[in-house]
């Protein structure tokens, strides 16, 4: 039995997969901040988690996916205010009793040290210093991401 949050996440991900393939993104669009091979958009308004998920989708992006601790730290360095929380693309899957990224993968327990409970209707937020489990209905800011396409150097044979 999927929760409404899980269903929303799956629906948006499926609609994303159905859309036609777009050309790779070489530079971050206006207003997006480049962080390594990603473009990030930090909201300055607040929303519950599922609305944040939908907002990123309308911008042809997704809620932030964090690969490892290193990426977390670099993202947190862009958050200047200690008191502000941002939704990312991770929520609790009741059916699998585990933290699940919106791309379908599960959280590697070593990646993030989450403060708070792992339970139904829990979603993950980050601050400048920590990672928190919050009720998904809580209205906080959010971070969208777009992946930059790596530019591969062409190798030409000697002429």
């Amino acid at each position: 039995q999927k929760s409404s949050i899980e269903k929303c996440s799956v629906d948006i991900q499926q609609s994303r997969n159905k859309t036609t393939e777009r050309p790779g993104l070489l530079n971050c669009p206006i207003y997006w901040q480049q962080l390594r091979e990603k473009c990030l958009l930090f909201s300055h308004t607040v929303n519950p988690w599922n609305n944040s998920l939908a907002d990123c989708s309308t911008k042809e992006s997704s809620l932030l996916l964090i690969r490892d601790k290193d990426e977390l730290i670099h993202t947190q360095n862009l958050i200047r205010d200690k008191a502000i929380l941002f939704w990312i693309g991770l929520n609790f899957s009741l059916s699998e009793k585990n933290w699940k990224w919106i791309n379908g993968s599960f959280l590697n327990s070593n990646d993030l040290e989450i403060r708070g409970d792992a339970k139904e209707n829990s979603c993950i937020s980050i601050s400048q210093t920590s990672v928190y489990s919050e009720y998904c209905s809580t209205e906080i800011r959010w971070i969208c991401q777009k992946e930059l396409t790596p530019v591969r150097n062409k190798v030409y044979p000697d002429s």
Epitope: I30, Y31, Q33, L41, S43, H44, T45, T58, K59, D81
Partner: antibody
Framework: QVQLQESGPGLVKPSETLSLTCTVS????????WSWIRQPPGKGLEWIGY???????NYNPSLKSRVTISVDTSKNQFSLKLSSVTAADTAVYYC???????????????WGQGTVVTVSS | EVVLTQTPGTLSLSPGERATLSCRAS???????LAWYQQKPGQAPRLLIF???SRATGIPDRFSGSGSGTDFTLTISRLEPADFAVYYC?????????FGGGTKVEIK
């Protein structure tokens, strides 16, 4: 209520550098984009560029070689420097808050009252 | 860059009449990231509409925006004396941000 106030000299000599500062009061400088826009006498609006609280900038290519925008988050201020000015740079200069593309305050939603800068010897 | 062309340059109308202002873009504006501003003499511009059709805080409902792609419209349903001013469209979907040349709404 966020308010913006421009300050700086109203008269600059040709070939010198125009320097203006905008003070943000009543709110935080974080997570917004802080723009400079100018309006020559009797003409339309021209965007000069913006700075994000992190210090990343985006400039109008037509002015990029002469423009520097900086931010001081501790003072809630951001500044404009425009080098090698000519009479064509005479304008009202506005600082403004840009909400970007997120939420209930998209686009340039708060403006300073503007400051007249004349370039003349 | 996206060039915005506003028509007409001047609109002469009487209070109570309907004003229709046009803004045409040289290329498609992504996600309808188009705003409208009102400017009165000696004052800074004021945001009226963002996202092509969303009214900014405190803007009366006689102001409405519409359009998508390359063609956008600002409509003032019944002109009041305070509405006579210059109106600018602006796109914020790509860099550099650009403004239209403006439409002056004057009293007939």
């Amino acid at each position: 209520q966020v308010q913006l106030q421009e300050s700086g000299p109203g008269l600059v000599k040709p070939s010198e550098t125009l320097s203006l500062t905008c003070t943000v009061s009543g709110g935080s400088i974080s997570f917004y984009y802080w723009s400079w826009i100018r309006q020559p006498p009797g003409k339309g609006l021209e965007w000069i560029g913006y700075i994000y609280h992190s210090g990343s900038t985006n400039y109008n290519p037509s002015l990029k070689s002469r423009v520097t925008i900086s931010v001081d988050t501790s003072k809630n201020q951001f500044s404009l420097k425009l080098s090698s000015v000519t009479a064509a740079d005479t304008a009202v200069y506005y600082c403004a808050r840009d909400g970007g593309i997120v939420g209930v305050t998209e686009a340039i939603d708060i403006w300073g009252q503007g400051t007249v800068v004349t370039v003349s010897s | 860059e996206v060039v915005l062309t506003q028509t007409p340059g001047t609109l002469s109308l009487s209070p109570g009449e309907r004003a229709t202002l046009s803004c045409r873009a040289s290329q498609v504006i992504s996600s309808s990231y188009l705003a409208w501003y009102q400017q009165k003499p000696g004052q800074a511009p004021r945001l009226l509409i963002f996202g092509a059709s969303s009214r900014a805080t405190g803007i009366p409902d006689r102001f409405s925006g519409s359009g998508s792609g390359t063609d956008f419209t600002l409509t003032i349903s019944r002109l009041e004396p305070a509405d006579f001013a210059v109106y600018y469209c602006q796109q914020y979907g790509s860099s550099p941000l650009t403004f239209g040349g403006g439409t002056k709404v004057e009293i007939k």
